[in-house]
Amino acid sequence: PEPPTACREKQYLINSQCCSLCQPGQKLVSDCTEFTETECLPCGESEFLDTWNRETHCHQHKYCDPNLGLRVQQKGTSETDTICTCEEGWHCTSEACESCVLHRSCSPGFGVKQIATGVSDTICEPCPVGFFSNVSSAFEKCHPWTSCETKDLVVQQAGTNKTDVVCGPQDRLRA
């Protein structure tokens, strides 16, 4: 009969034989033969393979370099890679999280729309009319202007996107 040209799922073709792939967490030591099964060995400490495979070497777990602001979010296993994240106040520069940068601060006149995480930067938004921010911050939202009326006061100086209104006593002569 013709030798196989295709094999089942989780198998591979070699020397006209369909051999079983090694399961995740294991590497290939020797191909199967007519009379023997594929020989696989578990990955060592700090190594992994995350798919059914015929790799002769396991991959090294990612190193979360503290000098780059990285720390371990999830420790790797024989079947999964280590997941890195950034130290508090920092976020990843890419999806692979190979290095970190300091969270951006929102300048005066801008407030924090979304606080940064280990993987995303701060998102700022301009303070709309009626709101202000007078600090550079990675946490502060735009604050509403003070309502002078509720304090039985009047506006003495209008607010801006960077400053609050200034309230003062009402003019008694107008009564």
């Epitope: 009969p1 199967c32 009379f35 023997t36 099964e37 020989e39």
Partner: antibody, heavy 123, light 107 residues
């Protein structure tokens, strides 16, 4: 009953020829690899060769000691295995066993044996 | 070729004894190791395949173990019908090779 029965052994002169037969019954003969194993008087077992099954085109493999002199064949319609032995030598003197070779990738083995037939090579 | 070395070549034991036979391969054979029993004037009989799998119909007093190059056949409590010669055989590489045999005799 599942069994193997050898025949054809006897006394033969050095350089002579002999053909052994092995009649199989009780199983689907063409599905199996079939083998010959021999045992010199008072000695251990020695694999001689095998012939693959129908799915593997009835191809053969031989031990180095008999390659080019011995030929294994089969007649599936008769469920019979053969061993044609040519250029026989004194060291070929042995009981010859027909054996079924079975198993899966987790280990192959001789799981059914005939009673053996004695071949004596002597002048 | 892979050489198979059995030890001891013979042993004397009594009914009820625990008997251990070892088989050493000249290279690792990844558990592709079979054991056979042969009585005088009879054909060999398969006892154990793939190191530790008991062939159908074989009594459970027979067991096998091992890995790499070293393998063992154990008879937990020797019975009168167990006095015979035992052979190991590797099934990983052609040519298939057998050990020299271990003859178990009555003490």
């Amino acid at each position: 009953e599942v069994q193997l029965v050898e025949s054809g052994g006897g006394l033969v002169q050095p350089g002579g020829s002999l053909r052994l037969s092995c009649a199989a019954s009780g199983f689907t003969f063409s599905d199996y690899y079939m083998s010959w194993v021999r045992q010199a008087p008072g000695k251990g077992l020695e694999w001689v060769g095998f012939i693959r099954n129908k799915a593997n085109a009835y191809t053969t493999e031989y031990a180095a000691s008999v390659k080019g002199r011995f030929t294994i064949s089969r007649d599936n319609s008769k469920s019979t295995l053969y061993l044609q032995m040519n250029s026989l030598r004194a060291e070929d003197t042995a009981v010859y066993y027909c054996a079924r070779y079975g198993g899966l990738k987790k280990g192959w083995y001789f799981d059914l044996w005939g009673q053996g037939t004695l071949v004596t090579v002597s002048s | 070729d892979i050489q198979m070395t059995q030890s001891p070549s013979s042993l004397s034991a009594s009914v009820g004894d625990r008997v251990t036979i070892t088989c050493r391969a000249s290279q690792g054979i990844r558990n592709y190791l079979n054991w056979y029993q042969q009585k005088p004037g009879k054909a060999p009989k398969l006892l154990i395949y793939y190191t530790s799998s008991l062939q159908s119909g074989v009594p459970s007093r027979f067991s096998g173990s091992g890995s790499g190059t070293d393998y063992t056949l154990t008879i937990s409590s020797l019975q009168p019908e167990d006095f015979a010669t035992y052979y190991c055989q590797q099934g990983i590489n052609l040519p298939w090779t057998f050990g020299g045999g271990t003859k178990v005799e009555i003490k």
